[in-house]
């Protein structure tokens, strides 16, 4: 496969601690700044449930235990999940809403059990998109998908 630069990248896997919080940072390329960004849950793309979506501005949007904030200057949007539960473990997507062809990348979320009673200050972990923006056939790493309102892969080496 010829190397293709993906339009959106995110961490392949993130790990949180039960009752703590985790932060995922997804990076997008130039041109997508003003588009809506979202965080969706479910491995089957077309049936994944959007948990939170930006309003098109940089203002933080929060719904239940999940928040999303877009930094258009840095072309990064940040998703935070708080008060984590074991049942939060699943396949999620960082995505950008675009008519006809959404952009998205899968993020696998795992939750480790809290070994001690709930801390007074919840544990917080941040995960950022990998620096690599290009994939080659020698590296079988998923860094980005291009979606057509269901699974639509742009590049998987």
């Amino acid at each position: 496969d010829a190397s293709i630069v993906t339009q959106i990248t995110g961490p392949t896997t993130v790990n949180g601690l039960e009752r703590g919080s985790l932060t995922v940072q997804c990076v997008y390329r130039s041109g997508w700044e003003t588009y809506l960004k979202w965080w969706c849950r479910g491995a089957i793309w077309r049936d994944c449930k959007i948990l939170v979506k930006t309003s098109g501005s940089e203002q933080e949007v929060k719904r239940d235990r999940v928040s999303i904030k877009d930094n258009q200057k840095n072309r990064t949007f940040t998703v935070t999940m708080e008060d984590l539960m074991k049942t939060d473990a699943d396949t999620y997507w960082c995505g950008i809403e675009k008519t006809g062809n959404d952009l998205g990348v899968t993020v696998q979320v795992t939750i480790d059990p809290a070994s001690t009673p709930a801390p007074t200050t919840p544990t917080s972990t941040t995960f950022t998109a990998p620096v690599t923006q290009e994939e080659t056939s020698s590296s079988p790493t998923l860094t980005g998908h291009h979606l057509d309102n269901r699974h639509k892969l742009l590049k998987l080496s």
């Epitope: 089957i44 077309r46 473990a89 699943d90 396949t91 699974h151 892969l153 998987l156």
Partner: antibody, heavy 119, light 112 residues
Framework: QIQLVQSGPELEKPGETVKISCKAS????????MHWVKQAPGKGLKWMGW????????TYADDFKGRFAFSLETSASTAYLQINNLKNEDMATYFC????????????WGQGTTLTVSS | DVLMTQTPLSLPVSLGDQASISCRSS???????????LEWYLQKPGQSPKLLIY???NRFSGVPDRFSGSGSGTDFTLKISRVEAEDLGVYYC?????????FGGGTKLEIK
């Protein structure tokens, strides 16, 4: 190239258990859910459900809840379909299938595993 | 469950003829995201099914342009403009909009 290779034909008695394998190659196994499809002799196709190949969480169509179990051996890039307490109506060819992001359809299929149930 | 009904059950054709297969769903298969996940598969004897059309009218890569899909809501059609010998087999429509996903009963395309 991407391949899904299934285990060979099975001959089992009613009441027994069978486990069919589907070994994936040519792609990162945990990035794509695996689906299972049943085809009874001379009949059409029936979607059985799928398994999240990262988390191992299965989803079953109503007709396949109970005696059917999807599982994984991630280190071997292999998905399994186990059928317990076999019945005559389980006699069929079972396919594993991968849905591709781009195609919006099942564009990679295993070759099928024929299960014969006979006393 | 969404019932997918295909007609005809069997379709005898001469090579070079046009063939048309109908698929009707028992309810609308427009997904909540606005897309219609209607696919067509061809299964030849002793083989696995092969994807022809996805999302009603999109030809999968490598599928000849003599295959075309159309329709909306509950009524869908697969057309083969000039049937070739390699097109013979059983055609299935499939809806992936509502769980459980369901296949049609199949249409056997055979030589007249």
């Amino acid at each position: 190239q991407i391949q899904l290779v299934q285990s060979g034909p099975e001959l089992e008695k009613p009441g027994e258990t069978v486990k069919i394998s589907c070994k994936a190659s040519g792609y990162t196994f945990t990035n794509y859910p695996m689906h299972w499809v049943k085809q009874a002799p001379g009949k059409g196709l029936k979607w059985m459900g799928w398994i999240n190949t990262y988390s191992g969480v299965p989803t079953y169509a109503d007709d396949f809840k109970g005696r059917f179990a999807f599982s994984l051996e991630t280190s071997a890039s292999t998905a399994y379909l186990q059928i317990n307490n076999l019945k005559n109506e389980d006699m069929a060819t079972y396919f594993c299938a991968r849905m591709d992001y781009y195609s919006n359809g099942f564009n990679y299929w295993g070759q099928g595993t024929t299960l014969t149930v006979s006393s | 469950d969404v019932l997918m009904t295909q007609t005809p059950l069997s379709l005898p054709v001469s090579l070079g003829d046009q063939a048309s297969i109908s698929c009707r769903s028992s309810q609308s298969i427009v997904h909540s995201n606005g897309n219609t996940y209607l696919e067509w598969y061809l299964q030849k004897p002793g083989q696995s099914p092969k994807l022809l059309i996805y999302k009603v009218s999109n030809r999968f890569s490598g599928v000849p342009d003599r295959f075309s899909g159309s329709g909306s809501g509950t009524d869908f059609t697969l057309k083969i403009s000039r049937v070739e010998a390699e097109d013979l087999g059983v055609y299935y429509c499939f809806q992936g909009s509502h769980v459980p996903w369901t296949f049609g009963g199949g249409t056997k395309l055979e030589i007249k």
